[in-house]
């Protein structure tokens, strides 16, 4: 059966998953969804890793942890009730039916006050060819539920030396958690 | 608007206890990592401690078996429990929001406190 | 002993440009993590003046800019101003520590 979280009408909701990398420079691909997990990859994704870096997400949809050390926990910026339903967390484990899955119940509740616009987190981006216009001094700040679907293809390299994480300490959050290796 | 404000400093003495509090607003701890550094009178900063996300905590080395950090998500804050202080714990303490990007791309920006003093002295 | 390597000091004549280097290792800059600088004066809390490598909060001038390549970051002061006198400190993460990493920090002195 699925985990349970829960989060307010326009407040930011996170569902944890984490894992441990095997040996060092070791991340394995990740992918989020809407929706159970299927038997294969993630249906309706809305964010994904690789073994270097997140290479893919879709607005409202973040990583705010330590992804390279396994901490995969995503967040939802600005929920509405719509966000409401399962979510799949898929620690993509190479070799045939390897892959850990974990199904996490999100559950929307009505703000108990009617929040005011206030914007919670700032995404700000420093490609200019992507969101903003050259020469016009800083990039601009943006929320995340502005920003149109990304897919990075070309992003900065992790070196081989990574060390062992020491990420899988005793969560208090009895989020998803596995260890690799 | 995102406010980290720290509370609880003041003067103690050696093997003494003492406890910070970090009240944020405009974020939720839950699902952030906050951190406490430290500078020491005319140094550097240094890393003290984090909870991440989920409430996993982390510590320096020079804190461990000594400091605990938590969170209450009700209030919204974070705490530092310092036990059996030295001399050397003498620093301010700042509370702070820390944040991961990739490649240049962040879900926010780091922010601190104004911090707040703690003397070890005897 | 700081974990990221920042020279002591630096100096330069009001207008001129100066940089400032932040050298990592591959286990921090050079594993992917981004790096953010502070400016620090004399009995304040640190100011955030660049955040991942390049991007400048709302109300920094635009004569900082920062920048990372490999496993070392740059913050560079173009047009120095009398009030740039203060220390710098570049922070990142590393693989090593779920926690943050510190430059030593960079005194800079205009002339």
């Known amino acids: 059966s699925e985990v349970e979280y829960r989060a307010e009408v326009g407040q930011n909701a996170y569902l944890p998953c984490f894992y441990t990398p095997a040996a060092p420079g070791n991340l394995v691909p990740v992918c989020w969804g809407k929706g159970a997990c299927p038997v294969f990859e993630c249906g309706n994704v809305v964010l994904r890793t690789d073994e270097r870096d997140v290479n893919y997400w879709t607005s409202r949809y973040w990583l705010n942890g330590d992804f390279r050390k396994g901490d995969v926990s995503l967040t939802i910026e600005n929920v509405t009730l719509a966000d409401s339903g399962i979510y799949c967390c898929r620690i993509q484990i190479p070799g045939i039916m390897n892959d850990e899955k974990f199904n996490l119940k999100l559950v929307i509740k009505p703000a108990k006050v009617t929040p005011a616009p206030t914007r919670q987190r700032d995404f700000t981006a420093a490609f200019p060819r992507m969101l903003t216009t050259r020469g016009h001094g800083p990039a601009e700040t943006q929320t995340l539920g502005s920003l149109p679907d990304i897919n990075l293809t070309q992003i900065s390299t992790l070196a081989n030396e990574l060390r062992d994480s020491r990420l899988a300490n005793d969560l208090r959050d009895s989020g998803a958690t596995i260890r690799i290796g | 608007e995102v406010q980290l404000v720290e509370s609880g400093g003041g003067l103690i003495q050696p093997g003494e206890s003492l406890r910070l509090s970090c009240a944020v607003s405009g974020f939720t701890v839950r699902g952030n990592y906050v951190a406490w550094v430290r500078q020491a009178p005319g140094k550097g900063l240094e890393w003290v401690a984090t909870?991440?996300?989920?409430?996993?905590?982390y510590y320096a080395d020079s804190v461990k078996g000594r400091f605990t950090i938590s969170r209450d998500d009700s209030k919204n804050t974070v705490d530092l429990q310092m036990n059996i202080l030295r001399v050397e714990d003498t620093a301010i303490y700042y509370c702070a929001r820390d944040t991961y990007c990739t490649a240049g791309i962040c879900p926010s920006s780091p922010v601190w406190g104004q911090g707040t003093t703690v003397t070890v002295s005897s | 002993q700081a974990v990221l390597t920042q020279p002591p000091s630096v100096s330069g004549a009001p207008g001129q440009r100066v940089t400032i280097s932040c050298t990592g290792s591959?286990?921090?800059?050079?594993?992917?993590?981004?790096v953010h600088w502070y400016q620090q004066l004399p009995g304040t809390a640190p100011k955030l003046l660049i955040y991942g490598n390049s991007n400048r909060p709302s109300g920094v001038p635009d004569r900082f800019s920062g920048s990372k390549s490999g496993t070392s970051a740059s913050l560079a002061i173009t047009g120095l101003q009398a009030e740039d006198e203060a220390v710098y400190f570049c922070q990142s993460h590393d693989t090593s520590v779920t926690g943050v990493v510190f430059g030593g920090g960079t005194k800079v002195t205009v002339l």
């Open positions: 909870i991440n996300g989920g409430g996993s905590p």
């Open positions: 591959s286990s921090n800059i050079g594993a992917g993590y981004d």
